[in-house]
């Protein structure tokens, strides 16, 4: 698959590559842009090419079938006849389809493809598609973009996080009028540089929730968790005590006192992670340093546990609200009014209890609101319309507000019952003080670097102080990693 | 009418280097619609393309996966012919070497003619 | 690379019958497809290119039809001549390939 030059040279790689002389694409309708394909991601991208004021031209092995699908205002022809009426052509066929291309080189020689392709799995081939493809026409300028757009979003116009194309290519020229096209095609290029970044480009589509995948499997472990602890607690144990059957309480008992504590650990995770980060930065007096693998991993997941955190809180409260409407709770309601006639009791109030179970789901609504105050603004298009400032008032002060206001809310929940043995049954504790295990530990950590003496050292460190100690030590091995300024959560 | 006359040694001793000349008549080397191949045929691997020379204002040589570190094609314009070069054979390059032309207006077609073959052995 | 496949190995037929040969590419070769016709001690001799487009000199009995991946080669009434080895071979994607052959001999 080698090409051996052995006569005649490609044009100058600095030269104007588009027609009319145009340096770089800054009038579309003046340019002509080669699409090579008929698939939908081509009719998409043509679609797009054309609202934008381009001329498209259809390279296809069939006009004549394929020029059905396109508007007329496409010139449907042979790939022969796309390739010499333009200087930028989209290569939007599969990868195994490249080499029957082969026979055209001559014709794209000092020519931009733009190679659109993905892959069925992640690192599928040894090299990237681009890669390969830059392998078959060495002559022709390859620049990777536009793959981890899908049609749909092409068609209708990009939108949030589909307006991101990241573009690479060895040729700087090249790049930057792919770059340019982007622009005018309403995304948002991200240059990745070389083609080397291609394999990286080519992965990015294909990974099914990468950040999610810890968040999810550490939600589904606590949850699991603390679904069994309430059932041994308040079902096995009953059972066991006096054979009473509590099973009825599974459905939604038992998942209701799971949905909150699990919900409250994920938010206390967020936080906890940057306060790690803290100590770390405070332990080693550097920001310089940086984070081990695994924190590193942790930070990056905050949006995720935080929105995760926020799905469990929401589902307790429809759970919450759905508590009354169930047949056993009638029953119970009409058995204690019963016992209560039998006792001969006129008045069952007790103030205490009306003011807790105020109190707790006053505090919880509250905690609701701030949390979904917090998920609205993890949306890229909500967040982009904030400041940093804004964004991390709203992520980290008012996110601390929500982890205090929560924890309030269980305690208030748990009230006085922490302290009397017969919640202990199996002496083991009550959900609720599992639940506050947690948050207690970040609402003390945020304290601690709250005070002046370590609040103070932690701005000089975020400002680029540095120990003299590890000054000393050189910094052998360590690569700058600088932490955001204040911990966001999602 | 095209004709393809091929001359060569038809022994060759393993790691030796094998030469092929293949000498065009009624077409030209240089051809901006034509593409001058080498194919081998053996009993054990069938008929093989070995690859393809071309013109279109510079030089084009494709060369198949499997023999691409030991092949060269040379044009040679001033005597109309293409010469094949495989180093390094062994005894598995024993077979019938043919040159052969493609048709080729942008695109790839037969081989519409033939050269009339050399058997080249590998043997010591 | 395309693998192409021929059946069958080898066809028994008398002279005056009709001979079909079938070839199959692994994946889609459009109807850049080609068959050749090659007799002991000689050169490949292109016959049918294009799928279905006989070549320069080749009589009407033989004929080609088929495209993406099945290609079937007739020969209507088999002639003493015709008895050889085909061959088929794609040429739209690279590398170009052969197929193993089909023997037509005597019945």
């Known amino acids: 698959m080698e090409s051996i030059s052995m006569m005649g040279s490609p044009k100058s790689l600095s030269e104007t590559f588009l027609p009319n002389g145009i340096n770089g694409i800054k009038d579309a309708r003046k340019v002509t842009v080669g699409v090579i394909g008929s698939g939908d991601f081509a009719k998409s991208l043509t679609i797009r090419l054309i609202r934008c004021g381009y001329h498209v031209v259809i390279g296809s092995r069939n006009p004549k079938f394929a020029s059905e699908f396109f508007p007329h205002v496409v010139d449907v022809t042979h790939h022969e006849d796309a390739l010499t009426k333009t200087n930028i052509i989209f290569v939007a066929i599969h990868r195994e389809h490249y080499t029957s291309l082969w026979d055209l080189r001559h014709l794209l020689v000092g020519k931009i493809l733009i190679d659109v392709s993905n892959n069925m799995r992640i690192n599928q081939y040894p090299e990237s598609n681009a890669e390969y493809l830059a392998s078959l026409f060495p002559d022709s300028l390859i620049v990777k973009g536009f793959n981890v757009v899908s049609a749909w979003a092409l068609q209708l116009g990009p939108k949030d996080a589909s307006r991101q194309v990241y573009i690479c290519s060895n040729n700087i020229q090249a790049r930057q009028q792919v770059i340019e096209l982007a622009r005018q095609l309403n995304f948002i290029p991200i240059d990745l540089g070389s083609l080397s970044s291609a394999r990286e480009i080519e992965n990015l589509p294909l990974r099914l929730f990468t950040l999610w995948r810890g968040p999810v499997v550490v939600a589904i472990s606590l949850a699991t968790f603390f679904f069994l602890y309430s059932f041994v607690r308040d079902v096995i144990h009953p059972y066991a005590r006096n054979q009473q059957s509590d099973f009825y309480k599974i459905p939604i008992e038992i998942v209701n006192k799971t949905l909150p504590i699990v919900a409250i650990t994920l938010l206390s995770l967020v936080y906890l992670a940057g306060l790690l980060a803290a100590a770390y930065q405070l332990y080693y007096g550097t920001k310089y340093r940086r984070f081990p693998p695994w924190l590193e991993t942790w930070l990056q997941c905050r949006k995720q546990l935080g929105l995760l955190s926020f799905f469990f809180a929401m589902v307790h409260v429809a759970y919450s609200l759905c508590l009354p409407m169930r047949r056993s709770e009638r029953y119970l309601f009409l058995n204690m009014a019963y016992q209560q006639v039998h006792a001969n009791i006129e008045n069952s109030w007790n103030e205490e209890e009306v003011w807790r179970i105020e109190m707790y789901i006053s505090f919880g609504i509250m905690s609701l609101g701030l949390l979904s105050l917090l998920a609205v603004t993890s949306i890229p298009s909500v967040s982009n319309a904030l400041n940093w400032r804004e964004f991390s008032f709203i992520q980290s002060t008012l996110g601390y507000v929500a982890l205090l206001i929560s924890t309030f809310h269980v305690l208030i929940y748990g009230w006085k019952r922490a302290f009397e043995e017969e919640y202990y049954r199996f002496y083991t504790p009550p959900n609720f003080v599992l639940a506050l295990v947690l948050p207690s530990i970040v609402i003390l950590g945020k304290i601690i670097l709250f005070l002046p003496c370590i609040s103070r050292k932690l701005k000089r460190i975020k400002k680029g102080w540095e120990k003299s100690q590890f000054l000393e030590e050189g910094m052998g091995g360590t690569i700058p990693h600088v932490s955001p300024e204040r911990v966001t959560v999602m | 009418q095209v004709q393809l006359q091929q001359s060569g040694p038809g022994l060759v001793k393993p790691s030796q280097t094998l030469s092929l000349t293949c000498a065009i008549s009624g077409d030209s080397v240089s051809s901006n619609s034509a593409a001058w191949n080498w194919i081998r045929q053996s009993p054990s691997r069938g008929l093989e393309w070995l690859g393809r020379?071309?013109?279109?204002?510079?030089?084009?040589?494709d060369y198949v996966v499997s023999v691409k570190s030991r092949i060269i094609f040379n044009p040679d314009t001033s005597k109309n012919q293409f010469s094949l070069q495989l180093n390094s054979v062994t005894p598995e390059d024993t077979a019938v070497y043919y040159c052969?032309?493609?048709?080729?207006?942008?695109?790839?077609?037969?081989?519409?003619?033939w050269g009339q073959g050399t058997l080249v052995t590998v043997s010591s | 690379e395309i693998v192409m496949t021929q059946s069958p190995v080898t066809l028994s037929v008398s002279p005056g019958e009709r001979a079909t040969l079938s070839c199959w590419a692994s994946?889609?070769?459009?109807?850049?497809l080609a068959w050749y016709q090659q007799k002991p001690g000689q050169a490949p001799r292109l016959l049918i290119y294009g799928a279905s487009t006989r070549a320069t000199g080749i009589p009407a009995r033989f004929s080609g039809s088929g495209s993406g991946t099945g290609f079937t080669l007739t020969i209507s009434s088999l002639q003493s001549e015709d008895f050889a080895v085909y061959y088929c071979q794609q040429y739209n994607n690279w590398p170009f390939t052969f197929g193993p052959g089909t023997k037509v001999d005597i019945k």
């Open positions: 052969a032309r493609v048709r080729q207006d942008y695109r790839s077609g037969p081989f519409d003619y």
């Open positions: 020379t071309y013109y279109r204002s510079k030089w084009y040589n």
């Open positions: 994946q889609s070769v459009s109807s850049s």
